[in-house]
Amino acid sequence: MMTGTIETTGNISAEKGGSIILQCHLSSTTAQVTQVNWEQQDQLLAICNADLGWHISPSFKDRVAPGPGLGLTLQSLTVNDTGEYFCIYHTYPDGTYTGRIFLEVLESSVAEHGARFQIP
C-alpha cells in the first residue's frame, strides 16, 4: 500500500535570467528511494540514482545543476522555462510517487517567489 506523500514547492515564480530551486520531499513512508527523475512535461531533465548518483540530460547540462539534496537548480531562466515540472520518485516497495511544480518565469524584476521550501 502506498502511504507516502510528496511535498513540493508548489507554484513558484522567478525572474528571467535568474535561478530557482525545484524541491520535492517524500514523507510518511519507509519506502527506499531508488531513483528520482526530474521531468519537464515529457522531457527528462535529470536523474538522481541511489547507486550511480546524478545525471543531467545533455540538452540541459548548461543550465541545470544537481541539488540541493534531491532537488534541482535551474539557472539562466528564460520565459520558455515557464511550465510544469515533475519529480518522480521510484521507490521500493511502494512504487512511483509524482510531485508537480508550476514555474512561471517573469520578465519583470518584481517576480514574487513562492515560500521557501526546506527539507527537514
Epitope: Q35, N49, L52, H55
Partner: antibody, heavy 120, light 116 residues
Framework: EVQLLESGGGLVQPGGSLRLSCAAS????????MSWVRQAPGKGLEWVSL????????YYADSVKGRFTISRDNSKNTLYLQMNSLRAEDTAVYYC?????????????WGQGTTVTVSS | QSVLTQPSSASGTPGQRVTISCSGT????????VSWYKYVSWYQQLPGTA?????????QRPSGVPDRFSGSQSGTSASLAISGLQSEDEAHYYC???????????FGGGTKLTVL
C-alpha cells in the same frame, strides 16, 4: 525505432584481443545506462559489464575483471567492449543492452548480438 | 556469490496457465540492501533470437507485451506466470536481478518452456 546494432565479433586466438561496438539509434543515448551480456553456445545468459551515463562508473563480472573494458562515446551514440587476454571460455554471442530509465529495473532493448569465437 | 535459481524446464498444453519460479540466495551478508533481489526482470528468448524483456520491476509489463504474461514477487522468490499458453510461447525464460551489494547483475539459469 529504438535499435542497437553490435559489430566487431570474429575468430581470435587465445590471448588475443577484440573490440566490440554497439551503435545505438532511436533514443537519447546519453540518458541511459548500458550493459554487455553474453551467451555461450547452448548456455544461459551471463552479464558481463555495465556503464553509467557518462562512462565515469563501470562494473564488471568477476569472470572478466581486469581483462575487459567497457566504454562509451556519447557523441557517436556508441558503446564499446575492449576484450583482452581472451580465453576459450569467452566464446559466446555478445549482446549490448539498454537499461530501463531506472537501470535496476531491467534491460528493455537488446541488440541482435555479435559472435566471438576464441580458438587456436 | 549471488544465485538466482530457476527450474531447468517447464511444460504445458495450449490454453493452460504455467508458472516459472526464480528464487534468490546470497552469501554476502554485508550487502547494503536488506533485500537485494527486490527488482526482478524476466526475459523471453525464442530460438535463434536475442532476449526480449517481458517483465521489469517485478510486475511491470512493457508496452507491446501481452497481458497473458504477469510477474509477482514474494520474499526471496519471484514468479512469471503465462496464462492462455500458446505454441509461440515455446522459448527459454530467464529471470535477472541487480545485486546492489556486489554491483553486478545476476541471471537465473533459464527455464525451457515446452508447449505440448
Amino acid at each position: 525505432e529504438v535499435q542497437l546494432l553490435e559489430s566487431g565479433g570474429g575468430l581470435v586466438q587465445p590471448g588475443g584481443s577484440l573490440r566490440l561496438s554497439c551503435a545505438a539509434s532511436g533514443f537519447t543515448f546519453d540518458d541511459y545506462v548500458m550493459s554487455w551480456v553474453r551467451q555461450a553456445p547452448g548456455k544461459g545468459l551471463e552479464w558481463v559489464s555495465l556503464i553509467n551515463w557518462s562512462g565515469g562508473t563501470t562494473y564488471y563480472a568477476d569472470s572478466v575483471k581486469g581483462r575487459f573494458t567497457i566504454s562509451r562515446d556519447n557523441s557517436k551514440n556508441t558503446l564499446y567492449l575492449q576484450m583482452n587476454s581472451l580465453r576459450a571460455e569467452d566464446t559466446a554471442v555478445y549482446y549490448c543492452a539498454k537499461h530501463w530509465i531506472v537501470y535496476q529495473y531491467g534491460m528493455d532493448v537488446w541488440g541482435q548480438g555479435t559472435t566471438v569465437t576464441v580458438s587456436s | 556469490q549471488s544465485v538466482l535459481t530457476q527450474p531447468s524446464s517447464a511444460s504445458g498444453t495450449p490454453g493452460q496457465r504455467v508458472t516459472i519460479s526464480c528464487s534468490g540466495t546470497i552469501s554476502n551478508i554485508e550487502t547494503k540492501y536488506v533485500s537485494w533481489y527486490k527488482y526482478v526482470s524476466w526475459y523471453q528468448q525464442l530460438p535463434g533470437t536475442a532476449p526480449k524483456l517481458l517483465i521489469y520491476n517485478n510486475v511491470q509489463r512493457p508496452s507491446g507485451v501481452p497481458d497473458r504474461f504477469s510477474g509477482s514477487q514474494s520474499g526471496t522468490s519471484a514468479s512469471l506466470a503465462i496464462s492462455g499458453l500458446q505454441s509461440e510461447d515455446e522459448a527459454h525464460y530467464y529471470c535477472a536481478s541487480w545485486e546492489g551489494g556486489l554491483n553486478s547483475w545476476v541471471f537465473g539459469g533459464g527455464t525451457k518452456l515446452t508447449v505440448l
